[in-house]
Interface confidence: low
């Protein structure tokens, strides 16, 4: 058997591997963008940069725009403010599960999950726990794989995000 490089290959936009890979790129970019704007230049956030193709760039810009809108979502802000960073793993998965507890999936909630992760990262930076950053990314993508992957596949992959939110006029 071969495959000593990156494991198990990848396929089209709806393959598990491609969705997770794009999700990882988008999440990292989203967190770096938001944390960078809030906390200024943070060396802890200087993770390796994935190459961005035109499609991923569009998706990143779409996420950035929605993230800005979520800043004014009071319900989400309250939920995030209540997070106890003493046991962040348990809290993360509980809040993430609560977001989808009713069994209804939509792109808004997927983005809210990313937004929640970025807020946790900011909390981690503020409380001098930079090692939590990669960990929080791992949790978010674990949750995405366990609970959201099949749904994202059913939407035709990440491209469905663009059609759901529409392409902003300034693009």
């Amino acid at each position: 058997m071969d495959g000593s490089g990156e494991q198990l290959g990848s396929g089209g936009p709806t393959s598990s591997e491609q969705i997770m890979k794009t999700g990882a790129f988008l999440l990292q970019g989203f967190i770096q963008d938001r944390a960078g704007r809030m906390a200024g230049e943070t060396p802890e956030l200087t993770l390796e940069q994935p190459p961005q193709d035109a499609s991923t760039k569009k998706l990143s810009e779409c996420l950035r725009r929605i993230g800005d809108e979520l800043d004014s979502n009071m319900e989400l802000q309250r939920m995030i403010a209540d997070v106890d960073t003493d046991s962040p793993r348990e809290v993360f998965f509980r809040v993430a599960a609560d977001m989808f507890a009713d069994g209804n999936f939509n792109w808004g909630r997927v983005v809210a999950l990313f937004y929640f992760a970025s807020k946790l990262v900011l909390k981690a930076l503020c409380t001098k726990v930079p090692e939590l950053i990669r960990t929080i990314m791992g949790w978010t993508l674990d949750f995405l794989r366990e609970r959201l992957l099949v749904w994202i596949q059913d939407q035709g992959g990440w491209e469905g995000l663009l059609s759901y939110f529409g392409t902003p006029t300034w693009q």
Epitope: G5, Q7, L8, R134, G138, R145
Partner: antibody
Framework: EVQLVESGGGLVQPGGSLRLSCAAS????????MHWVRQAPGKGLEWVAS????????YYADSVKGRFTISADTSKNTAYLQMNSLRAEDTAVYYC????????????????????WGQGTLVTVSS | DIQMTQSPSSLSASVGDRVTITCRAS??????VAWYQQKPGKAPKLLIY???SLYSGVPSRFSGSRSGTDFTLTISSLQPEDFATYYC?????????FGQGTKVEIK
């Protein structure tokens, strides 16, 4: 060529300890999740523990939690399983296996799938 | 923890037969399911990952599918070298469980 070689198995008395090693070659262990899986004589496969060296995450089956410790020394490209308070029911062939590759902050969606396995090392717990 | 109930525990088949093995998850899981083949005295070999993706180097007669909480491994035309024990495996939040195994024997 990817290779995993286990060592450290043997006969031990109940309540005793053993440390298993899994020497990896052909890839950088830092960027893969690693797993230990055991198989009691004539029985099926049982997952024991996993580690993601990049994060330092460790995970354990309930049956070994508190008794076994998984670790990795990335400078030696080796994973370990420290087994304490051994019981007769821990008797098995212990395999180490490689899981998913790490990229951009994430162990890939195939991280649970074990694509390379060692030859196994037999641990016998008996008085 | 999520349990994987594998059936049948054993089956007898002839070369050329179509063979189907099923694993049922005790609760809803993602497609984080893999299938392995093991021969006596040997380490398991990965056949299928992500429920339906064929691992490199594995013959195309092996395929995997998913329907709800049921995961199926199909061997379209059994070959002499396919007589072995097959295991399914799932991961939920990095906790892994294997099915009990299915022994495929010569009829």
């Amino acid at each position: 060529e990817v290779q995993l070689v286990e060592s450290g198995g043997g006969l031990v008395q109940p309540g005793g300890s053993l440390r298993l090693s899994c020497a990896a070659s052909g890839f950088n262990l830092s960027y893969y999740s690693m797993h230990w899986v055991r198989q009691a004589p004539g029985k099926g496969l049982e997952w024991v523990a996993s580690i993601s060296p990049y994060y330092g995450y460790t995970y354990y089956a309930d049956s070994v939690k508190g008794r076994f410790t998984i670790s990795a020394d990335t400078s030696k490209n080796t994973a370990y399983l420290q087994m304490n308070s051994l019981r007769a029911e821990d008797t098995a062939v212990y395999y180490c296996a490689r899981g998913g590759a790490y990229y951009f902050g994430y162990y890939g969606s195939g991280s649970y799938a074990m694509d390379y396995w060692g030859q196994g090392t037999l641990v016998t717990v008996s008085s | 923890d999520i349990q994987m109930t594998q059936s049948p525990s054993s089956l007898s088949a002839s070369v050329g037969d179509r063979v189907t093995i099923t694993c049922r998850a005790s609760q809803s899981v993602s497609s984080a399911v893999a299938w392995y083949q093991q021969k006596p005295g040997k380490a398991p070999k990965l056949l299928i990952y992500s429920a339906s993706s064929l691992y490199s180097g594995v013959p195309s007669r092996f395929s995997g599918s998913r329907s709800g909480t049921d995961f199926t491994l199909t061997i379209s035309s059994l070959q002499p070298e396919d007589f072995a024990t097959y295991y399914c495996q799932q991961s939920s939040y990095s906790l892994i469980t294997f099915g009990q195994g299915t022994k495929v024997e010569i009829k």
